[in-house]
């Protein structure tokens, strides 16, 4: 807390300009009128104020807006956002996908900090649901911020702003995140031809079910092995040894290095070791021929 | 951030010294920068400093001797410092933008005018 002072003759400040980095803070308090600071906060992130005096004019800005900034000094806050608590950020309205873009860009190249993820939070609110170019915008800055979001978070997301997403921005993501995600992606590249949807759905197949395993399986996809260890266990355990075959394709082969992981691990421990040893890669823990199968699962739901 | 000042030393009242601050990113280019100096047992103090759009202004006790300038493409910022006089013995620092703002300073690089 800044000592209220008289400002000394002479230093009043007319404008915000560089001739106040070698303001003492109590000058700064003094001699900067808080609504000249207000209709030029524009220029505060063209001048290097230190630490400190951006406090005093945080500081300002607070008592002249008690309620909360208005959009049009948030939009030019620049790196005195770094300043803010997120219980400052939530008295905030931010509507304009420019104040967005203007303030995430002062956190570029940086974690995302409680800061961001309150500012985020407000924005996605106060807009109703998570649109295709806040999408676009959010993922540019921070490729996870998509797998930060909860299941129920998710299911905000339109099918058209599936467009917008990147392989990469899915890395994180788990599979209750991609069971999610999935359907909203299978509704958005509905329309494209198969080798097409296939490169836009691979890295949505984690919350894939079997049946669209299976049909995929039918379309020579040819999906690599990485693909293949990232779906879903239980959507991998009922396929056949010739779907799995039609659905790798030529990278059927890397089953072999994979044999002891999931899914793959569990996959062959359903599959008969007939069937296995038709792919010729010397895949072991098969069913033992002349091995009666039950479906325990099949057999509760009978009962 | 990393920010590495360089180019400091002994030098006689009235020598010349050119300081260097180099800084991870393209942190210089876009953000206004600031050199400052600590005296020993003093608070440390902005000398001179260039707006994010290009123009320069300096602290009084400097005006006509000191000279701030940088180079966008090696994402450096200088400080020309000539008639060096006593008074300007300091470890001199720079610093601009997200670091500035959170206060986060190199190792600086220490002068001494005698």
């Known amino acids: 807390e800044v000592e209220k002072t008289a400002c000394p003759s002479g230093k009043k400040a007319r404008e915000i300009d560089e001739s106040l980095i070698f303001y003492k803070k109590w000058e700064l308090e003094a001699c900067v009128d808080a609504a000249l600071l207000a209709t030029q906060m524009d220029r505060v992130n063209a001048i290097p104020f230190t630490y400190e005096q951006l406090d005093v004019l945080k500081h300002k800005l607070d008592e002249l807006y008690p309620q909360g900034y208005p959009e049009s000094v948030i939009q030019h806050l620049g790196y005195l956002f770094l300043k803010m608590s997120p219980e400052d950020i939530r008295k905030w309205n931010v509507t304009s996908l420019e104040t967005l873009k203007a303030l995430l860009e002062v956190n570029k190249g940086h974690e995302m900090s409680p800061q961001v993820a309150t500012l985020i939070d407000r924005f996605v609110k106060g807009r109703g649901q998570l649109d295709k170019d806040t999408l676009d915008t959010l993922t540019a800055f921070y490729p996870g911020y998509l797998c930060s979001l909860s299941p129920e978070e998710l299911s905000s997301v339109p099918p058209s702003s599936i467009w917008a997403v990147r392989p990469q921005d899915l890395d994180t993501c788990d599979p209750r995140q991609l069971d999610v995600l999935y359907p909203k992606a299978r509704l958005a590249f509905q329309n494209m031809n198969g080798s097409e949807y296939f490169v836009k759905i691979q890295s949505f197949l984690g919350g894939a079910p079997t049946e669209d395993l299976k049909a995929l399986s039918q379309q020579n996809v040819s999906m690599d092995l990485a693909t293949f260890m990232k779906l879903r266990t239980d959507a991998v355990l009922p396929l056949t040894v010739a779907e799995v075959q039609k659905l790798l394709g030529p990278h059927v082969e890397g089953l072999k290095a994979e044999e002891r992981h999931r899914p793959v691990r569990d996959w062959i421990l359903r599959q008969r070791q007939d069937d296995l040893d038709t792919l010729g890669l010397g895949l072991q823990g098969g069913i033992p021929n002349g091995y009666l199968v039950l479906d325990l699962s099949m057999q509760e739901a009978l009962s | 951030v990393q920010l590495v000042e360089s180019g400091g030393g002994l030098v006689q009242p009235g020598g010349s010294l050119r300081l260097s601050c180099a800084a991870s990113?393209?942190?210089?280019?876009?953000?206004?920068v600031a050199w400052y100096r600590q005296a020993p047992g003093e608070q440390r103090e902005p000398v001179a400093a260039m707006t994010s759009g290009g123009s320069t202004i300096y602290a009084d006790s400097v005006k006509g001797r000191f000279t701030i300038s940088r180079d966008n493409a090696k994402n450096t910022v200088y400080l020309q410092m000539n008639s060096l006089k006593p008074e300007d013995t300091a470890v001199y620092y720079c610093?601009?933008?997200?670091?500035?703002?959170?206060?986060?300073w190199g190792q600086g690089t220490s002068v001494t005018v005698s």
């Open positions: 990113g393209s942190m210089f280019s876009i953000n206004a």
């Open positions: 610093n601009g933008g997200w670091s500035l703002a959170l206060d986060y």
